[in-house]
């Protein structure tokens, strides 16, 4: 059987990972959104730089915040089958993304964002690594 | 503009009923909480809950779950707070407030509610 | 039950710079919100989600955050000033709190 690049293979990951941010925002930042607003009171904290691979550490730093969002959510407006299952396939792509030895240390920007903020920031990253890679 | 606007002062007898209204004008009604919070004199801020117009949908502090009801008829934008029976410990201010995404960003006037033993 | 702990008042000079603390096990995963509230009136949205503030509040309200605590600061307070002010945030649960409040007194 024919084997995929590791390069296509991170591509492929990167793309799955963008495709799950994007279905989360989707179901957040909607007119539901006004629906939640307990759901904008959490904090989430957004990388100084990501534009590596290694940089995906901090999107892993910020899941369990992510997880307990959408636990707000379970049988009330926003609809996924099983989010904890969600968050920990998002995990899963991530650690294949970044290496599960990498040590890097993630640095915070030092204002909060909101989880609208947060996601929308995180699927630039993912479009931005993608479209490096493509160059 | 928008705003808020409380139907006016209650004086009241213990075991009484009473609906209090907030009436919103100037925004789409339907799509914002509208919460209720309670101030007893020379005290601070109490959230009770919240209710989304839309559906009716309801948030009640743990404080405050039983001892009040909270309803809308959005057809005329307006939101309410009610007691079955009123105790003197009820004696408050009460305002409603607009829960928009960042904050409780616009509050009506109050409602003093005075309820004699 | 969760509290968000404030001092109960502050005092200070005109022109001078006033900071009111807020403190909750809860802050660094939650925004806070803070409201003035002067005698007789509604209260007023001042600072919501940590440091950003509304349309037609004066720019010497500001606001900051470290950790388990946020932190109202007014510089160059006026006379108008004088009011109470809560902290707000929300609970690990689907629910918002206030803070008992702290008077801010504007002496002279």
């Known amino acids: 059987a024919p084997t995929s690049s590791p390069a296509k293979e991170t591509q492929q990951h990167l793309e799955q990972l963008l495709l799950d941010l994007q279905v989360l925002l989707r179901g957040i930042d909607n007119y539901k959104n006004l629906k939640l607003p307990m759901m904008l009171t959490f904090k989430f904290y957004l990388p100084k730089q990501a534009t590596e691979l290694k940089h995906l550490q901090c999107l892993e730093n910020e899941l369990g915040a992510l997880q307990r969002v959408l636990d707000l959510t379970q049988s009330k407006s926003f609809h996924l089958e099983d989010a904890g299952n969600f968050i920990s396939n998002i995990r899963v792509t991530v650690v294949k993304l970044k290496g599960s030895e990498n040590k890097f240390e993630c640095q915070f920007d030092d204002e909060p964002a909101t989880v609208v903020e947060f996601l929308r920031r995180w699927i630039a990253i993912c479009q931005s690594i993608i479209s490096t890679m493509t160059q | 503009e928008v705003q808020l606007v409380q139907s006016g002062t209650e004086v009241k007898k213990a075991g009484d009923s009473l609906k209090i209204s907030c009436k919103g004008s100037?925004?789409?009604?339907?799509?914002?909480?509208i919460g209720w919070v309670r101030q007893m004199p020379g005290r601070g801020l109490e959230w009770m809950g919240t209710i989304y117009p839309a559906d009716s949908d309801t948030r009640y502090s743990p404080s405050f779950q039983g001892q009040v009801t909270m309803s809308a008829d959005k057809s005329i934008s307006t939101a309410y707070l009610q007691w079955g029976s009123l105790r003197a410990s009820d004696t408050a201010m009460y305002y409603c407030?607009?829960?928009?995404?960042?904050?409780?960003?616009?509050w009506g006037q109050g409602t003093m509610v005075t309820v004699s033993s | 039950s969760y509290e968000l702990t404030q001092p109960p008042s502050v005092s200070v000079s005109p022109g001078q710079t006033a900071r009111i603390t807020c403190s909750g096990d809860a802050l660094p995963r939650k925004f806070a919100y803070w409201y003035q509230q002067k005698s007789g009136q509604a209260p007023v949205l001042v600072i919501y989600?940590?440091?950003k503030r509304p349309s037609g509040i004066p720019e010497r309200f500001s606001g900051s955050s470290s950790g388990t605590t946020v932190t109202l600061t007014i510089s160059d307070v006026q006379a108008e000033d004088d009011a109470d002010y809560y902290c707000?945030?929300?609970?690990?649960?689907?629910?918002?709190?206030f803070g008992a409040g702290t008077k801010l007194t504007v002496l002279g």
């Open positions: 989600q940590d440091t």
């Open positions: 707000q945030s929300a609970d690990r649960s689907d629910s918002y709190v």
């Open positions: 407030a607009r829960f928009s995404s960042s904050a409780y960003d616009i």
């Open positions: 100037g925004y789409n009604f339907d799509t914002y909480w």
